[in-house]
Amino acid sequence: SAPGEDEECGRVRDFVAKLANNTHQHVFDDLRGSVSLSWVGDSTGVILVLTTFHVPLVIMTFGQSKLYRSEDYGKNFKDITDLINNTFIRTEFGMAIGPENSGKVVLTAEVSGGSRGGRIFRSSDFAKNFVQTDLPFHPLTQMMYSPQNSDYLLALSTENGLWVSKNFGGKWEEIHKAVCLAKWGSDNTIFFTTYANGSCKADLGALELWRTSDLGKSFKTIGVKIYSFGLGGRFLFASVMADKDTTRRIHVSTDQGDTWSMAQLPSVGQEQFYSILAANDDMVFMHVDEPGDTGFGTIFTSDDRGIVYSKSLDRHLYTTTGGETDFTNVTSLRGVYITSVLSEDNSIQTMITFDQGGRWTHLRKPENSECDATAKNKNECSLHIHASYSISQKLNVPMAPLSEPNAVGIVIAHGSVGDAISVMVPDVYISDDGGYSWTKMLEGPHYYTILDSGGIIVAIEHSSRPINVIKFSTAEGQCWQTYTFTRDPIYFTGLASEPGARSMNISIWGFTESFLTSQWVSYTIDFKDILERNCEEKDYTIWLAHSTDPEDYEDGCILGYKEQFLRLRKSSVCQNGRDYVVTKQPSICLCSLEDFLCDFGYYRPENDSKCVEQPELKGHDLEFCLYGREEHLTTNGYRKIPGDKCQGGVNPVREVKDLKKKCTSNFLSPEKQNSKSN
């Protein structure tokens, strides 16, 4: 069974009075429609809340929105709708909040039918004041901030124009027409695709990929016959139509599109897709869809160039382009990812990797759980995690898995214990070691959030009935205490806490319903008085990540190094605090063959760690092309796994082979590239 609620934790005494003094109710003077909430800046305490209410009339829709602002983490709100002239804000564009702590906010307004362009409201002082700006175009997308300079904005118009502002939306300039997709790259570079023959859809596979590094003064065509493109880490990817047929292949560039190499990945047909699941500066996880409407594909992991790929996981669940995948980066522990596979019998199972896709295994069965009806053997089964796919299937799963980089090792997720994911009502499970071991944390579905870098976990039961109770744990979910935050239960709609899990405040959102009206209401609870003192050295203990066998000399080694962390003791009731920085100590490991992947033209036979040469590359779909032209490729058969820091130990040295191979792709040989200026 799950840990007891109000079990004698010996943790927080007299907490009811402490929490009652720190519980703040705010009733919004609104009819219930929809509500959206955004945090402005980091550690500023500023929250913007936009409520909208639609009344469909006979000929048109009447809409009303209200804007509220809090500067104390949601304890108090002020109606600031007058700052935006009581204008109706379009919720589909959300609130565009600037990067980092810029304090910038852009709201896109609804305008009447015949207007020349759209309208935005801009703030650069954390929403204290707004400036109304009429646009020379109707926006199709939310304003996109340059990650490097929050004064630079990008937007697409409904007429497929690419518009840029250099002064935070004050003035706009159309820098290109016929644009399908645009993205900011690094150093204020803009990448975008254009069509020539009428529309994005009609030209799919015949688009051009362009780049501007000076906000539209000059341009360079960096790709032709483009189907789509994407950015991940330091990699620029383009899927490119083949000359001969309707298949397409991935090409990759690490120099902003100046030179391209063909990725050693299978080509895909019209009905298939590629998807970048995750990317960093070292490598990329790429999903390649299987032919036919199977709902699954294969995950490949790249080398440091993004060119050579190793098969990582077969039968990876991914429903359709832009559809559902359960692929989740466990941010609380390096190298850990969780996803789902579709097994031969069409059941869905969860898999986990601890070494960045090198090996995948099932999740260990929680010690305090029994195998359910899906298990053939009642003593042997696994934990299966509910994520995006389960949510899309309308199972009783209110939240996806949760992890935070500053709450080391903690992963919280809904799941079931058996041979596959069950459609029965799930329970909530927690891991404190990044997914190696699991414990049932709460019975039944819950909303949950992490506060104070893991010092507090808060949960609310998912129920169709009104609720008035919140649960909290100061022991990483090992035991729970309950607090009644209001006498009058509310229909719960969501938990909100500041992104980054450093806050001690949690807001409970919902609505009250009476005979005639329903109103939005929020309760913000500050846990600061529960954790009365700041944590000291004695409150932390040392933990070795990825430890599986202390008798193994290289225990804890993942990607060539091990890391020890200072972690809060489960018995300590204290504040990590807003300035808490994870203390970790890395130590380098000796190299083994596991630290290398097989280079182009080599493969690993099953259950063997050595890379062997593919016999004359026969029968392998391995067209190889560097920089768009025929190249000499020299290799010793091994390549260090991206991000691997091992030293010494095994150093696989091979006779260097010359794998000179005809480059079969005519994509973007340098002479095809052209530049032009506005």
């Epitope: 010996g10 943790r11 022991a475 090992q478 035991c479 203990t541 040392i542 070795l544 430890s547």
Partner: antibody
């Protein structure tokens, strides 16, 4: 089989220091924390502190903070405990013990291997 | 630091008796508790870790239970070799031991 062998008995004058060694054999010394525990004649067990050889992370009981230094030498699989400003109350048997480990937590699973003990007598 | 209170401090029993020793923590330590046996002139020996897990090689007549603040060591049928002093030890704060329980022949 893992063994911890400690240095021999010591007789020390008040105000001086003592350094006791603890050499591990037959196991992966670097992957376990080593704790130091003392037992005064006829008294109970008292934890002084511990060290993790990888990274040399040491921590100490509040009572001994500033007076005890625990170190480890990975190359010789040896841990050391130095106690300074000795007084007569420090007369005790000093044990080193390996902290058992089933997970990444170094100190949570009890001390599964103990040294034979080193008697330290503080007398003027 | 977390205090550990062991009771009783001395216990007289006969071979074959069921013996129970309790240990109370000054605050919750979850299940992070170990039990040791020590005989005169010898180093302690680990019996139980994580409150209820039996260390390998330890006879099954020894068992541990409890979580939070209350813990128990039980010897189901006392054997001649079991007359010794027993210590509990918490591991979720800076390590502290209980005062010990001496099990002597009645």
């Amino acid at each position: 089989q893992v063994q911890l062998v400690q240095s021999g008995a010591e007789v020390k004058k008040p105000g001086s220091s003592v350094k006791v060694s603890c050499k591990a054999s037959g196991g992966t010394f670097r992957n376990y924390a080593i704790s130091w525990v003392r037992q005064a004649p006829g008294q109970g067990l008292e934890w002084m502190g511990g060290i993790i050889p990888i990274g040399g992370w040491a921590n100490y009981a509040q009572k001994f903070q500033g007076r005890v230094t625990i170190t480890a030498d990975e190359s010789t699989s040896t841990a050391y405990m130095e106690l300074s400003s000795l007084r007569s109350e420090d007369t005790a048997v000093y044990y080193c013990a390996r902290q058992g480990r089933k997970t990444g937590y170094y100190y949570y699973y009890g001390m599964d291997v103990w040294g034979q003990g080193t008697t330290v007598t503080v007398s003027s | 630091d977390i205090q550990m209170t062991q009771s009783p401090s001395t216990l007289s029993a006969s071979v074959g008796d069921r013996v129970t020793i309790t240990c109370r923590a000054s605050q919750s330590i979850s299940s992070w508790l170990a039990w040791y046996q020590q005989k005169p002139g010898k180093a302690p020996k680990l019996l139980i870790y994580k409150a209820s897990s039996l260390e390998s090689g330890v006879p099954s007549r020894f068992s541990g239970s409890g979580s939070g603040t209350e813990f128990t060591l039980t010897i189901s049928s006392l054997q001649p070799d079991d007359f010794a002093t027993y210590y509990c030890q918490q591991a979720d704060g800076h390590i502290t031991f209980g005062g010990g329980t001496k099990v002597e022949i009645k």
